[in-house]
């Protein structure tokens, strides 16, 4: 499955929108920074079959979409930017879902992929727990925004590697 070039552009647009969503200076929130334990090893793309990589990417985008689709998120961000950001993520999910269906038919996805998906889910659970503990404060959301920018950039890099494999 070849991810369309528009998918890559959509990923960049999502990152830019996320950058624009910042409402307060990140530098006023330095003390709130947190180690969420991003599962970097799941995104290095070396030990993966293509089907595995795509399903991990899908989980990453799905969890990001879910996080920014909550009521608390709606209250935290400027509505039009949030809607554009969600639309970009939704389009990426559609692209990836089409690929997951195609690729799973080609390769049997081993059990280790479930571990990778679980690692991504636990990562987002830690983010949600942090937001809850910080009572969804503006700084907590700002820290999470920066964290998601980091994780989305890992996703972008994995997608680039997948395209090079094609």
């Amino acid at each position: 499955c070849d991810l369309p070039q528009t998918h890559s552009l959509g990923n960049r647009r999502a990152l830019i929108l996320l950058a624009q969503m910042g409402r307060i200076s990140h530098f006023s929130c330095l003390k709130d920074r947190h180690d969420f334990g991003f599962p970097e090893e799941e995104f290095d793309g070396h030990q993966f079959q293509k089907a595995q990589a795509i399903s991990v990417l899908h989980e990453m985008i799905q969890q990001t979409f879910n996080l920014f689709s909550t009521e608390d998120s709606s209250a935290a961000w400027e509505q039009s930017l949030l809607e554009k950001f969600s639309t970009e993520l939704y389009q990426q999910l559609n692209d990836l879902e089409a690929c997951v269906i195609q690729e799973v038919g080609v390769e049997e996805t081993p059990l280790m992929n479930e571990d990778s998906i679980l690692a991504v889910r636990k990562y987002f659970q830690r983010i949600t727990l942090y937001l809850t503990e910080k009572k969804y404060s503006p700084c907590a959301w700002e820290v999470v925004r920066a964290e998601i920018m980091r994780s989305l950039s890992f996703s972008t890099n994995l997608q680039k590697r997948l395209r090079r494999k094609d």
């Epitope: 830019i16 624009q20 990140h26 920018m149």
Partner: antibody
Framework: QVQLQESGTVLARPGASVKMSCKAS????????MHWVKQRPGQGLEWIGV????????TYNQKFKDKAKLTAVTSANTAYMELSSLTNEDSAVYFC?????????????WGQGTTVTVSS | DIVLTQSPASLAVSLGQRATISCRAS??????????MHWYQQKPGQTPKLLIY???NLESGVPARFSGSGSGTDFTLNIHPVEEEDAATYYC?????????FGSGTKLEIK
């Protein structure tokens, strides 16, 4: 590969202003903070400030807030720093540096530096 | 501002031996799982190069003979075994709060 190309050596008079550039290539310019760092001859490093080209957000070291102005033109993938009211103390090498991993605020790629000499 | 005090100011180490550079912050730069201290190497006439980030993480492409440790206010850069190409000035930098500051540098000479 990531490259930061800075403008050349500048000679300026005391009291004047200078504007230096830093052209980025090999990465998404709009999604990385860009720091500026000062190094006087034979001395250590000083952090001046940082700009986010994606939205123009800037943060300065208070020591430099009346001295330096950071801007970026995304269409040209270029960041700029303007130094005003120059004195001998401003004679230094100025580096633009790409921020690493969003909120770690460390610097992974550096330009080759712009040398500013202030002399009457 | 957080002041970073590096020691020693200079040291000479024999080839193959261990070089240890210390960086002490006037205030803690650690918070919630991360220590916001980083290390750079600068060779004469060159730009600084990132070696270690977040106190102990080796930057990609940096040889494994470089290692960092510490938390709170006390941090250490170790180089072992030292090689000739390691002759340089080493700087620590914190990003715990604004403004970010650098240490005054440690010049390493290889004997």
């Amino acid at each position: 590969q990531v490259q930061l190309q800075e403008s050349g050596t500048v000679l300026a008079r005391p009291g004047a202003s200078v504007k230096m550039s830093c052209k980025a290539s090999g990465y998404s310019f709009t999604t990385y903070w860009m720091h500026w760092v000062k190094q006087r001859p034979g001395q250590g490093l000083e952090w001046i400030g940082v700009i986010y080209p994606g939205n123009g957000d800037t943060t300065y070291n208070q020591k430099f807030k009346d001295k330096a102005k950071l801007t970026a033109v995304t269409s040209a993938n270029t960041a700029y720093m303007e130094l005003s009211s120059l004195t001998n103390e401003d004679s230094a090498v100025y580096f633009c540096t790409r921020n690493y991993k969003y909120d770690y605020y460390t610097m992974d790629y550096w330009g080759q530096g712009t040398t500013v000499t202030v002399s009457s | 501002d957080i002041v970073l005090t590096q020691s020693p100011a200079s040291l000479a180490v024999s080839l193959g031996q261990r070089a240890t550079i210390s960086c002490r912050a006037s205030k803690s730069v650690s918070t919630s799982g991360h220590s916001y201290m980083h290390w750079y190497q600068q060779k004469p006439g060159q730009t600084p190069k990132l070696l270690i980030y977040l106190a102990s993480n080796l930057e990609s492409g940096v040889p494994a003979r470089f290692s960092g440790s510490g938390s709170g206010t006390d941090f250490t850069l170790n180089i072992h075994p030292v090689e000739e190409e390691d002759a340089a000035t080493y700087y620590c930098q914190h990003s715990g709060e604004l403004p970010f500051t650098f240490g005054s540098g440690t010049k390493l000479e290889i004997k």
